[in-house]
Every structure is written in structure tokens, then in C-alpha cells.
């Protein structure tokens, strides 16, 4: 846990038959059928993997 990998999702958008590919810092959100910024997953027993506020961890392309 903690490492980000290239995510290639098999989910298909409502308007396209092409599988959605997301870059390293994104994941496919089926709600909006798009690649979106994705945080590191955490579980109740391990807590956050980062001490940063949720929603701000490991996003080098976003301004501080």
C-alpha cells in the first residue's frame, strides 16, 4: 500500500466503447465516468498513509 501504479480500468464510459486509461495520480471514477485525482487508500485500522489533509496528499501538479 502506498505505491501508485498506472491504472488501466476496464470500465467503459456511457459515450464510448474505448476502455478508460488513467495516469499515475488518477483513477477511474464510475460515477462521473472519467479519470479524476485519486488519493492513497487507507483503512480504519491503519489510518491515513499521509499526515496531510485528505484530498491534498501526493498531488505534485496541484498548487500548495
Amino acid at each position: 500500500m502506498g505505491a501508485r501504479r498506472l491504472r488501466v480500468r476496464s470500465q467503459r464510459s456511457r459515450d464510448s466503447s474505448v476502455p478508460t486509461q488513467c495516469n499515475q495520480t488518477e483513477c477511474f471514477d464510475p460515477l462521473v465516468r472519467n479519470c479524476v485525482s485519486c488519493e492513497l487508500f487507507h483503512t480504519p485500522d491503519t489510518g491515513h498513509t499521509s499526515s496531510l489533509e485528505p484530498g491534498t496528499a501526493l498531488q505534485p501538479q496541484e498548487g500548495s
Epitope: D29, L31, V32, N34, V36, S37, L40, F41, G55
Partner: antibody
Framework: EVQLVESGGGLVQPGGSLRLSCAAS????????IHWVRQAPGKGLEWVAW????????DYADSVKGRFTISADTSKNTAYLQMNSLRAEDTAVYYC??????????????????WGQGTLVTVSS | DIQMTQSPSSLSASVGDRVTITCRAS??????VAWYQQKPGKAPKLLIY???NLYSGVPSRFSGSGSGTDFTLTISSLQPEDFATYYC?????????FGQGTKVEIK
Amino acid sequence: EVQLVESGGGLVQPGGSLRLSCAASGFTISRRSIHWVRQAPGKGLEWVAWITPSDGNTDYADSVKGRFTISADTSKNTAYLQMNSLRAEDTAVYYCARRVCYSSVRGCAGAMDYWGQGTLVTVSS
Amino acid sequence: DIQMTQSPSSLSASVGDRVTITCRASQDVSTAVAWYQQKPGKAPKLLIYGASNLYSGVPSRFSGSGSGTDFTLTISSLQPEDFATYYCQQSHASPPTFGQGTKVEIK
């Protein structure tokens, strides 16, 4: 610090229009989805619309389809809700919210993690 | 659209009680369910996402479980600040839909 601030609410007559704004700070809206959720007085939460500012994709609740338009200006880091042909039943507090996705074995584990303070829209003659 | 049916619509409980709120989806939503707490005049606050994951800063007395169509929010020992209205929400498919809410009142 992540913050969402709504503005633009007020009193409007039936059939009138309003434009709500949702100014975001502490994160970039272009890589998220932004949602509008409303709450009529004494009632529950009702999702209204979402937008992915990166590509302009949108979706709407049936109750507002054709009357409301969600948009975003990534240069201003702000989302908007243009509300036309307003009805008495549109009277509510309108919240904007940011959806977060956590990477899990199932893909995106998502929810609305940050909400604005809300802006009251009253439709009355 | 996916309907989310919450029960009960309201309940009365005492400090220290164990409280359980359930939410049933009209179709399979996997684990794409979140729970929110709302107090009068305030915006909702996220408690649980992904059906069972505790959001940052939320006390560990809150827990969520379930997958598919049946979901539960449990407060293991009710505290004075927990008296509020709780909502479930599915985000498996658009439109995202909320349950009608459960108001937790003081007995």
C-alpha cells in the same frame, strides 16, 4: 486549506433566474468533480448536478434538467449553477461539494469530503 | 435511478447507547456508499466512504459495513455531540442518490 464558498442566493420570483457560484481554494477543481446538492426547508438532501471541469461533462437530477446548467471556470477555480425558470419547489439551501476518490482494490472509493456553507435560494412571489 | 431507503426515519436513544442505522439500495451498488452527519443549519460532514472506511478525523465509535444492497452505520456508544441527522448516499452510478435521512434524538 481546502475551502468551498457559495454565493449568489437570494429571493427570486417564480419564473426568474439566479446564478450561484462556488469558489474553491486549496485544491484544483479541474482534476475533481464538483457537485451541487440542495436541501429544502425541513427536508433531506437532494443531489442536483455534477461537473468534471477537465472536460465539461455534466449530469443533472431529473427535477432540474432543462432548467439548470452547471459550469466551471478552471482559471477562476470556480463552479457555477445557472438556475432558470425557477419554481417554488426549488426553494432550498444549495451546497456545493467536492468529490474525493480514494484508490482501492475496487477502484475509486469516493464521497463528498468538503462542502460549502450553503446559500439560501427562496422562490416566492 | 438507484433508490436508497434508510431506516428508521428517526430514533430516540440515550448517551452510551449503541445505535444502528440501515440503508438499502434498490440495486447492487457494490461498496459505493458513503454516510454523512448533518446538524441543523450546518453542511453535512462525511463520516464513512466506500461503505466501511472511516474518514479522517471521525471518531472510531462510528463504523460502516455492508456491500451489494444492504448497508449499516453503527455508533458504538452514542455521545452528546452525535445527536444529528444521518444520510447514506450511493455513488455507484449517476445520479448519486441520498437516503431520506435518520434523525437521532435524545430519549
